[in-house]
């Protein structure tokens, strides 16, 4: 039975050309993560592998970099970033857990003057 | 005794192929993931593929991508690797390794197995 | 792909010195790095995983330290079987890379 759940950053904010962390965290489970996926839409950004390490997709080599833990860092935000984007994470005996964030990316006065949360 | 014995090297023809063969012993080998490194001779180490206990994640360095093939078969206790379109930069001893569990450091490596590639 | 320099490429010493070779990943690794020591014809042997954790059975005379981007591999007493070459490898990103290799000579 899968027990775990996923907490993520939710709903975030950021400017354009500024960057933002997206960050997951499995909890209440004892289950080995084997695997975390970053993707947008349907398209992989990058992939956190417990024995291989961290795979980042060629397209997206200049832009993201990995981390803090297994969190993603976004680089160079354009607006056509504004999106959905999933932590997939593979565990082990418990299976995939998957965690939704919402990016919004704005215009520097937009996103100044917003009340939206926004990740240090 | 935890082993590797790897098999399956020799003389090659460029753009022939050659399948490399890592029986390994002493240790649960379904538990591990598992690499290939090579030295071309008088020269340093390359990490050459990895592959994940289960098979579900595999990683390939840029020069060997599109050309090997690494897999296993837990149930014989072997690592493969399938060789195409050889070049003459892949002369190198192949070792396979196994890593220290959650350390990816590689603590048993093979004698490994000499592969020429040379017309 | 991530570069790995090491430093020196060789250097002589002398039985009883301490040694310090150097490596330099071209971006962050966290602590994702090993070192090996290499003797002609052997395979490579692991001393350090992790950056500072020694593999068992190696003698405490091996330490490593360092992350991010800069690190350190100590022979804090050289004896005759160390005389070989040494290989730092970062196993953060795919591929794995190694350091290009330091010869540890008598000198």
């Known amino acids: 039975m899968m027990t775990g759940t996923i907490e993520t950053t939710g709903n975030i904010s950021a400017e354009k050309g500024g960057s933002i962390i997206l960050q997951c965290h499995l909890s209440s489970t004892t289950a080995q993560v084997t695997q975390v996926n970053w993707e947008q839409q349907d398209q992989l950004l990058a992939i956190c592998n417990a024995d291989l390490g961290w795979h980042i997709s060629p397209s997206f080599k200049d832009r993201v970099a990995p981390g803090p833990g297994l969190g993603l860092t976004l680089q160079s935000l354009t607006v056509n970033d504004t999106g959905e984007y999933f932590c997939i994470y593979h565990t082990y005996p418990d299976g995939t857990y998957t965690g939704r964030i919402f990016l919004e990316v704005l215009e520097s006065s937009v996103a100044e003057h917003g009340a939206r949360f926004q990740i240090p | 005794e935890v082993q590797l014995v790897e098999s399956g090297g020799g003389l090659v023809q460029p753009g022939r192929s050659l399948r490399l063969s890592c029986a390994a012993s002493?240790?649960?080998?379904?538990?591990?993931?598992m690499h290939w490194v090579r030295q071309a001779p008088g020269k340093g180490l390359e990490w050459v593929s990895g592959?994940?206990?289960?098979?579900?994640?595999?990683g390939y360095a840029d020069s060997v991508k599109g050309r090997f093939t690494i897999s296993r078969d837990n149930a014989k206790n072997s690592l493969y690797l399938q060789m195409n379109s050889l070049r003459a930069e892949d002369t190198a001893l192949y070792y396979c390794?196994?890593?220290?569990?959650?350390?990816?450091?590689?603590?048993?490596w093979g004698q490994g197995t000499m592969v020429t590639v040379s017309s | 792909d991530i570069q790995l320099t090491q430093s020196p490429s060789s250097v002589s010493a002398s039985v009883g010195d301490r040694v310090t070779i150097t490596c330099r990943a071209s971006?962050?690794?966290?602590?994702?790095l090993a070192w090996y020591q290499q003797k002609p014809g052997k395979a490579p042997k692991l001393l350090i995983y992790?950056?500072?954790s020694l593999q068992s059975g190696v003698p405490s005379r091996f330490s490593g330290s360092g992350s991010g981007t800069d690190f350190t591999l100590t022979i804090s007493s050289l004896q005759p079987e160390d005389f070989a070459t040494y290989y730092c490898?970062?196993?953060?990103?795919?591929?794995?890379?190694f350091g290009g290799g330091t010869k540890v000579e008598i000198k």
């Open positions: 390794a196994k890593p220290v569990p959650k350390s990816r450091g590689l603590d048993v």
């Open positions: 002493g240790f649960t080998f379904g538990d591990y993931a």
């Open positions: 592959i994940t206990w289960n098979s579900g994640s595999i």
């Open positions: 971006q962050g690794i966290s602590s994702w």
């Open positions: 992790g950056a500072s």
């Open positions: 490898q970062q196993a953060f990103y795919l591929p794995w890379t």
